[in-house]
């Protein structure tokens, strides 16, 4: 004969676990139903009555099958230096990421808690490592024979033009000036731009500060608790 299918709530066999989308209730000592994403437990189970679930209220969510008595609060609205990449629904939290030209100075479980503007390398310095979604630009002094005359978070050091006759020698922040009308270059002319950071969700690593950069704003990073993780809600 096929095994009888147990309906929740039921007492599990000794040594066995509850099925998928069920949890073991320590007080009732029964396997009881979890609530689906977008819901929470309004009434916990007893020995004879199963869990009663209810929908999450506005601005709250549950992402997993759960038996939490209260839905989690969605994060606060995205700030002006952020874009909302995922809206707050009953089943998912709002996710804010940094807008172009900014990076995440303080990440959270999903998205970013605090964005900061990408560092701009001043004239005489070029981008050594481009900014990403979670790390700042790293600048380096332009090596002999190269220059950067811009304040930019994307420009690298470019080679000086090679003159037949040099009118003014180039330095780290200025190209060479030729007297001849036909200068040559060791590389194609024109500014070299690095691409803007691509959206990734890599873990934030604190960039190494460079003394040779344009002054940048200091940020006081709030270190409050992250939004609470759903309590014991895995399947």
């Amino acid at each position: 004969l096929p095994a009888q299918v147990a309906f929740t709530p039921y007492a599990p066999e000794p040594g066995s676990t509850c099925r998928l989308r069920e949890y073991y209730d320590q007080t009732a000592q029964m396997c009881c139903s979890k609530c689906s994403p977008g819901q929470h437990a309004k009434v916990f189970c007893t020995k004879t009555s199963d869990t009663v679930c209810d929908s999450c209220e506005d601005s709250t969510y549950t992402q997993l099958w759960n038996w939490v008595p209260e839905c989690l609060s969605c994060g606060s609205r995205c700030s002006s230096d952020q874009v909302e990449t995922q809206a707050c629904t009953r089943e998912q939290n709002r996710i804010c990421t940094c807008r172009p030209g900014w990076y995440c100075a303080l990440s959270k479980q999903e998205g970013c808690r605090l964005c900061a503007p990408l560092r701009k390398c001043r004239p005489g310095f070029g981008v050594a490592r481009p900014g990403t979604e979670t790390s700042d630009v790293v600048c380096k002094p332009c090596a002999p024979g190269t220059f950067s005359n811009t304040t930019s978070s994307t420009d690298i050091c470019r080679p000086h033009q090679i003159c037949n006759v040099v009118a003014i020698p180039g330095n780290a922040s200025m190209d060479a000036v030729c007297t001849s009308t036909s200068p040559t270059r060791s590389m194609a002319p024109g500014a070299v731009h690095l691409p803007q950071p691509v959206s990734t969700r890599s873990q934030h690593t604190q960039p190494t500060p460079e003394p040779s950069t344009a002054p940048s704003t200091s940020f006081l990073l709030p270190m409050g608790p992250s939004p609470p993780a759903e309590g014991s809600t895995g399947d």
């Epitope: 320590q26 309004k42 009434v43 916990f44 007893t46 004879t48 009555s49 309590g231």
Partner: antibody, heavy 119, light 106 residues
């Protein structure tokens, strides 16, 4: 508005059985998620949970007192009754009844009734 | 049975002080803890449930935190009317109260 009130004898003799009644209003024990429990507090001591009963007649007892306790309900009268056998002077306490929410914490309490066990 | 160890058993603080009470559970109770205030001769009054959810009408100076086995109850700025005994209640596995903390004004 939710109210609960305990009633019963102020004095019982050792070995006797104590019967306490909780009469409540503002909610019904026929509503899913509702429960009523009993808690006691000896003079100058901490609170101790004794027992409670749910809307669906599921009952829970403090394991250390289970053999002496019985809880029952009369839904039509809005009453819950607790009996405790073989009373002893150490059972002298204020006995409270309280409402339990569907997520299992006590939110409303009665004013308490003082029971002295003495010969 | 789950045991709840509440500390300190009593404390004396000045008006405006920050007061912290802890409860430690003998096993994991998730976030199923409530905090009650009891004044002499009165029934306990629910302040907080599910670790940190404040009951309607309870002042925001009361707060709670923790999960698993370690829980904290805080009065951010003690007021004269806060003189009482405070109890934690675990309701993750049956029901157990802590031993209580008597709060007095210096």
């Amino acid at each position: 508005q939710v109210t609960l009130k305990e009633s019963g004898p102020a004095l019982v003799k050792p070995t006797q059985t104590l019967t306490l009644t909780c009469t409540f209003s503002g909610f019904s024990l026929s509503t899913s998620g509702m429960g009523v429990g009993w808690i006691r507090q000896p003079p100058g001591k901490a609170l101790e949970w004794l027992a409670h009963i749910w809307w669906d007649d599921d009952k829970f007892y403090n394991p250390s007192l289970k053999s002496r306790l019985t809880i029952s309900k009369d839904t039509s009268k809005n009453q819950v009754v607790l009996t405790m056998t073989n009373m002893d002077p150490v059972d002298t306490a204020t006995y409270y009844c309280a409402r339990l929410t569907g997520t299992r914490y006590f939110d409303y309490w009665g004013q308490g009734t003082t029971v002295t066990v003495s010969s | 049975d789950v045991q709840m160890t509440q500390s300190p058993s009593s404390l004396s603080a000045s008006v405006g002080d920050r007061v912290t009470i802890t409860c430690k559970a003998s096993q994991d109770i998730n976030k199923f803890i409530a905090w009650y205030q009891q004044k002499p001769g009165k029934a306990p009054k629910l302040l907080i449930h599910y670790t940190s959810t404040l009951q309607p009408g309870i002042p925001s100076r009361f707060s709670g935190s923790g999960s698993g086995t370690d829980f904290t109850f805080t009065i951010s700025s003690l007021q004269p009317e806060d003189i009482a005994t405070y109890y934690c209640l675990q309701y993750g596995n049956l029901w157990t109260f802590g031993g209580g903390t008597k709060v007095e004004i210096k």
